[in-house]
């Protein structure tokens, strides 16, 4: 049997509930040796690739996907996969992004604390952080429709 690739994890900075027009960065993490990270929205067919991979720790690499100004169309579930030659990994669990209207209230927090979804976490019922199953994501200029992985 082939050697299994560890599942990637996904997190969002500064969190998973983002005010309209603010920025969010998805962070995908995997093992060292990753050539390409892919951020998928909902399914295989809508994604963005990057080869801008950095080493997060001696055993982990990461890539960051930033949306400068989120719109309502960016809301939904996202997941990561990676390519470590010669194979694509499984997908991470989904991370659900919520986009909220800015209320302007001084007591209302702008974001939820940084949230993540990874292989060791159980699926969550939390409506803005679906750790174990789900998907949807970035705007046209950020995430593109494709028919195949590569």
């Amino acid at each position: 049997q082939e050697e299994d690739l560890p599942r990637p994890s996904i997190s969002a900075e500064p969190g998973t509930v983002i005010p309209l027009g603010s920025h969010v960065t998805f962070v995908c993490r995997g093992p060292v040796g990753v050539q390409t990270f892919r951020l998928e929205r909902e399914s295989r067919s809508t994604y963005n690739d990057t080869e801008d991979v950095s080493q997060a720790s001696p055993s982990e690499s990461e890539a960051r996907f930033r949306i400068d100004s989120v719109s309502e169309g960016n809301a939904g579930p996202y997941r990561c996969i990676y390519y470590k030659p010669p194979k694509w990994s499984e997908q991470s669990d989904y991370l659900e992004l919520l986009v909220k209207e800015t209320s302007g209230g001084p007591d209302s927090p702008d974001t939820e604390p940084g949230s993540s979804a990874g292989p060791t976490q159980r699926p969550s019922d939390n409506s803005h952080n679906e750790h174990a199953p789900a998907s949807q994501g970035l705007k046209a200029e950020h995430l593109y429709h494709h028919h195949h992985h590569h």
């Epitope: 690739l5 194979k87 976490q121 019922d125 679906e130 199953p133 789900a134 992985h149």
Partner: antibody, heavy 120, light 111 residues
Framework: QSVKESGGDLVKPGASLTLACTAS?????????MCWVRQAPGKGLEWIGC???????IYYASWAKGRFTISKTSSTMVTLQMSSLTAADTATYFC??????????????WGPGTLVTISS | ELDLTQTPASVSEAVGGTVTIKCQAS??????LAWYQQKPGQRPKLLIY???SLASGVSSRFRGSRSGTEYTLTITDLECDDAATYYC?????????????FGGGTELEIK
């Protein structure tokens, strides 16, 4: 895009049998969950397990571990090896692939099934 | 191990009526829930994925919803062609828990 099962047969209790699922029109390298599901006559669907066609990760139903083995044998074929078969394993065995365009891994593509009969 | 309890096991309803089928998960599975329709001698057909999203080509008379760990398939304005067995399935595959399980099925008869 399609998947098709083969290898169904009439075999005696205690025997072993290997079923094959042949894929066409898509690439295993893209990383699909290829799953095996069975259905005894007049009964419901029963999940056996899945293999991720690129990474090689395999997941089994707890009852299937040990007697059932899922493997990727080529770039277009996945197999299900079954051992120590009993009459309770008599069923139509389906191969299914998760979706290309939908999230949350639903089985979108199903084969027609292959019948396995265990009888002396 | 994950268990999906599907109710009712069978239901009979008249043409034009509405049927509700429930699937209760023994643990949290988020939106990893699909619904299938199967007619005798045929392979299953995907109806709903991600708990509430309609698969392409499926009539909008089929609707999926979720409340916590309870999932519901509602079929409105029933037609004779809806007579079939319906199954829910957890579509999460991973080490967190054993997914993949199907509910026991609901046989729908159209009167």
């Amino acid at each position: 895009q399609s998947v098709k099962e083969s290898g169904g047969d009439l075999v005696k209790p205690g025997a072993s049998l290997t079923l094959a699922c042949t894929a066409s029109g898509f690439s295993f390298s893209d990383g699909y969950y290829m799953c095996w599901v069975r259905q005894a006559p007049g009964k419901g669907l029963e999940w056996i397990g899945c293999i991720h066609s690129s990474s090689g990760s395999i997941y089994y139903a707890s009852w299937a571990k040990g007697r059932f083995t899922i493997s990727k044998t080529s770039s277009t074929m996945v197999t299900l090896q079954m051992s120590s078969l009993t009459a309770a394993d008599t069923a139509t065995y389906f191969c299914a692939r998760d979706s290309e365009s939908y999230g949350y891994n639903p089985c979108e593509l199903w084969g027609p099934g292959t019948l396995v009969t265990i009888s002396s | 191990e994950l268990d999906l309890t599907q109710t009712p096991a069978s239901v009979s309803e008249a043409v034009g009526g509405t049927v509700t089928i429930k699937c209760q998960a023994s643990q949290t599975i988020s939106n990893y829930l699909a619904w299938y329709q199967q007619k005798p001698g045929q392979r299953p057909k995907l109806l709903i994925y991600a708990a509430s999203s309609l698969a392409s080509g499926v009539s909008s008379r089929f609707r999926g919803s979720r409340s916590g760990t309870e999932y519901t398939l509602t079929i409105t304005d029933l037609e004779c062609d809806d007579a079939a067995t319906y199954y829910c399935q957890c579509t999460y595959y991973g080490t967190t828990y054993v997914g993949g399980a199907f509910g026991g099925g609901t046989e729908l008869e159209i009167k």
